[in-house]
């Protein structure tokens, strides 16, 4: 028998520095977690103690903090090289700055293979990107070889900016021939490493002949066997065992997100490359694990540029940006409109001639807007200003919801109106009219939404049975502020870009902004 240790991360999302327990900015260092310096300590410890170790990343290193905003992927290549990752799969967020934003900072600088079997380049891009990412890689481990085959969510064109010269194929269809190729090269131990979410990970384990282990990402799935060490609730045991169509037991793993855990899986193979046993658990990277001093020093060196960036002007406002709780928790506020407009703008994807855009709607809990921005400071808007407005380090995500769920959400928005509670929704691409004289749960008297399948966008009444795409904060997608109906009834959820980054990019693009209060949210009394 031959034993392999797989260490894995996924959806790190730019958390190079240690974070608080909820993966936001570290405040009390003695209780902080994760970060590349701490990760390095644990990886080194395991590499010294065990013979055959692979360190793998299942995508979405890009996007999530000011580190990515400033360094644009150079930080990912640098620190992943320093940690000696053995392979990485491309995630959807690796395309956030377009293909060039992937090629130059990451693909050309990484000294490890970056993988995806289901992304095919065409046109002029094919020769430019050829050989920079690979469908599979054979890794020498000890005196054996292990094949790693990569995959990426085929929804990427809707979630990011891969352009028109990359084709995202069905994962299973694309993976099978590459696995077959590895078999012809006499590689009998094969790991599928990818970024399509836990459901697809399980399907790959079931359907792709020859895959021995699946290491996934995208859905931020936390798996654990036994008592979990922190706040995350396990979605199943680690590893999650799938019985393949040809009768094999295939372990599937994922390690939550944000570098909080290091996935740790031990696999025992027989001489023919069959999995005999698999066991392990994610390792919580808490403060009991010291940060490596040399990596920490490097982080501090790179940090300097971030501090300088946060005080630079992004753009100007010529109007007061009303982000006060007195406004945003009671009525339409122009800060809410600005943020929602930025959210929609960030999701412009012309992927189908029938649609002017794939999504037109935004909702945003008023309680998530934490500060106004005064225009009487020469109109200057900085990252620092925006961090006061959006201090929680969240993301603006894409969900699919039925009209009926949206209706419930808007009823919840005003179910206890007048108490300055955070659930009051700010909107974009939506016109809502409330009648507060009616009883809670029946106060939405008009709800019109902007069409997407149209050449001239206009507002139409919400249809209860129709499925709509909506951009919203991850906080709402996870049922925050009492929006349990969103969490329970969403049909799809894809995590998006860092909230501050979305707004800062929009302001930089617009240069001068002047958002108005324009009648997106109205109140009527009595007969409508």
């Amino acid at each position: 028998a031959w034993e392999l240790t797989i260490l894995h991360t996924n959806d790190v999302h730019s958390r190079l520095e240690q974070t608080s327990e909820d993966s936001s900015k570290c405040v009390n260092a003695s209780r902080c977690m994760g970060g590349v310096a701490r990760l390095f300590t644990k990886v080194q410890q395991i590499r010294r103690a065990e013979p055959n170790v692979l360190l793998l990343d299942a995508g979405d290193q890009y996007q999530g903090t000011i580190w990515f905003t400033v360094y644009k992927g150079a930080e990912v290549a640098h620190f992943m090289n320093a940690l000696r990752y053995d392979a990485m799969a491309l995630g959807n967020h690796e395309f956030d700055n377009g293909v060039e934003g992937l090629i130059e900072p990451l693909l050309k600088e990484a000294k490890f293979p970056i993988l995806s079997a289901n992304i095919k380049a065409k046109g002029p891009l094919a020769s430019q990107i050829s050989g920079l990412y690979l469908p599979y890689k054979v890794l020498p481990v000890g005196d054996e070889v292990v094949g790693i085959v990569g995959y990426t969510s085929k929804e990427t064109p809707f979630l990011s900016n891969p352009g028109t010269n990359l084709v995202f194929e069905d994962e299973i269809t694309a993976l099978q021939p590459e696995v077959d190729k590895l078999k012809t090269l006499n590689v009998n131990k094969i790991i599928a490493l990818g970024h399509s979410g836990f459901e697809m990970d399980k399907l790959i384990a079931q359907k792709v002949r020859g895959v021995d282990v699946v290491v996934g990402g995208h859905s931020n799935t936390f798996l654990y066997t036994g008592n979990p060490p922190s706040k995350e609730v396990p979605a199943g045991k680690y590893p999650f065992i799938v019985t393949s169509d040809d009768g094999r037991k295939v372990p599937v793993v994922q390690a939550y997100a944000f570098g909080k855990y290091l996935g740790y899986l031990k696999i025992e193979f027989d001489e023919r490359g069959n999995v005999i046993s698999s066991h392990g658990n994610p390792i919580l990277l808490n403060s009991s694990i010291p940060e490596d001093p040399s990596i920490k020093a490097d982080i501090n060196k790179w940090r300097i540029k971030l501090d300088n960036y946060s005080t630079q002007e992004l753009g100007k406002t010529i109007v007061y940006l009303d982000g006060s709780s007195q406004s945003c928790r009671f009525r339409e506020c122009n800060m809410g409109n600005l943020i929602c407009d930025a959210m929609i703008n960030n999701n412009l994807r012309h992927t189908d001639e029938m649609f002017w855009n794939h999504v037109s709607m935004c909702i945003l809990n008023g309680g998530g807007i934490r500060s106004p921005i005064d225009e009487r400071n020469n109109g200057t808007i900085t990252w620092e200003n925006l961090a006061a407005v959006l201090p929680f380090g969240g993301t603006f995500d894409l969900v699919q919801l039925k009209g009926s769920t949206l209706k419930k959400a808007f009823e919840h928005s005003v179910h206890r109106y007048g108490q300055s509670t955070g659930e009051f929704l700010q909107v974009g691409g939506i016109h809502v009219v409330y009648d507060l004289s009616r009883k809670p749960g029946d106060r939405v008297v008009k709800l019109d939404v902007l069409c997407t399948k149209c050449r001239v966008p206009s507002y139409d009444p919400l249809k209860m049975d129709e499925v709509y795409k909506v951009i919203l904060p991850n906080f709402l997608a996870n049922g925050g502020d009492g929006f349990q109906m969103i969490k329970d009834e969403l049909l799809r959820h894809d995590s998006g870009d860092q909230d501050i980054n979305v707004v800062s990019t929009y302001i930089s693009k617009m240069k001068v902004i002047y958002p108005a209060v324009e009648g997106r949210i109205k109140f009527s009394t009595g007969s409508h």
Epitope: N81, G131, G142, N186
Partner: antibody, heavy 121, light 107 residues
Framework: EVQLVESGGALVQPGRSLRLSCAAS????????MHWVRQAPGKGLEWVSG????????GYADSVKGRFTISRDNAKNSLYLQMNSLRAEDTALYYC??????????????WGQGILVTVSS | EIVLTQSPGTLSLSPGERATLSCRAS???????LAWYQQKPGQAPRLLIY???SRATGIPDRFSGSGSGTDFTLTISRLEPEDFAVYYC????????FGPGTKVDIK
């Protein structure tokens, strides 16, 4: 500038041993996997062996498996090839080559000038 | 094991002419793992093309690579005097395989 300088080549009798060295400079040695590639007189190129940055992964061509051993000393920026049970068909110019990756291999982006090993009685 | 064959064995051309070199694999291979090297007499090989079509750093744009599956091509659009050399294709699967080489000499 990347420099790879091979040494240790000699004329040896069949069945004897020889150790080749490669001194690397101009780059961070332990950032890359390294290889030995050989070329018999007037013939093509043949990959001999490769080693990852930390010696955690090692590979050999079937023709040398069990006879040759690759190793590296990152502190000395050096790559080695211990060649035992040498045969006449091992006669070749031996090149030291640097890979693009550190823990796996893909291609040779820098080469030394080569060192001649002649196996003859 | 994948076997690479190169044709022609020798290509005799004049400076300024176009050179087309062929490399054929015994079975279908991914273009991501196909590279081309140039070797001048008495010198070490030099990486020209990787991923079948991407030029290595510092390689002039008169060199281009193409192909997929089993058939790959290296093209030198206008031969310069310094291009007369032996060209090898290489594949990486679980180990390395080189083709036997094509010699481009002066007509």
């Amino acid at each position: 500038e990347v420099q790879l300088v091979e040494s240790g080549g000699a004329l040896v009798q069949p069945g004897r041993s020889l150790r080749l060295s490669c001194a690397a400079s101009g780059f961070t040695f332990d950032d890359y996997a390294m290889h030995w590639v050989r070329q018999a007189p007037g013939k093509g190129l043949e990959w001999v062996s490769g080693i990852t940055w930390n010696s955690g992964g090692i590979g050999y061509a079937d023709s040398v498996k069990g006879r040759f051993t690759i190793s590296r000393d990152n502190a000395k920026n050096s790559l080695y090839l211990q060649m035992n049970s040498l045969r006449a068909e091992d006669t070749a110019l031996y090149y030291c080559a640097k890979d693009r990756y550190y823990s796996s291999w893909l291609l040779f982006d820098n080469w030394g000038q080569g060192i001649l090993v002649t196996v003859s009685s | 094991e994948i076997v690479l064959t190169q044709s022609p064995g020798t290509l005799s051309l004049s400076p300024g002419e176009r050179a087309t070199l062929s490399c054929r694999a015994s079975q279908s291979v991914s273009s991501s793992y196909l590279a081309w090297y140039q070797q001048k007499p008495g010198q070490a090989p030099r990486l020209l093309i990787y991923g079948a079509s991407s030029r290595a750093t510092g390689i002039p744009d008169r060199f281009s690579g193409s192909g997929s599956g089993t058939d790959f091509t290296l093209t030198i659009s206008r031969l310069e005097p310094e291009d007369f050399a032996v060209y090898y294709c290489q594949h990486y699967g679980s180990s390395f395989t080189f083709g036997p080489g094509t010699k481009v000499d002066i007509k």
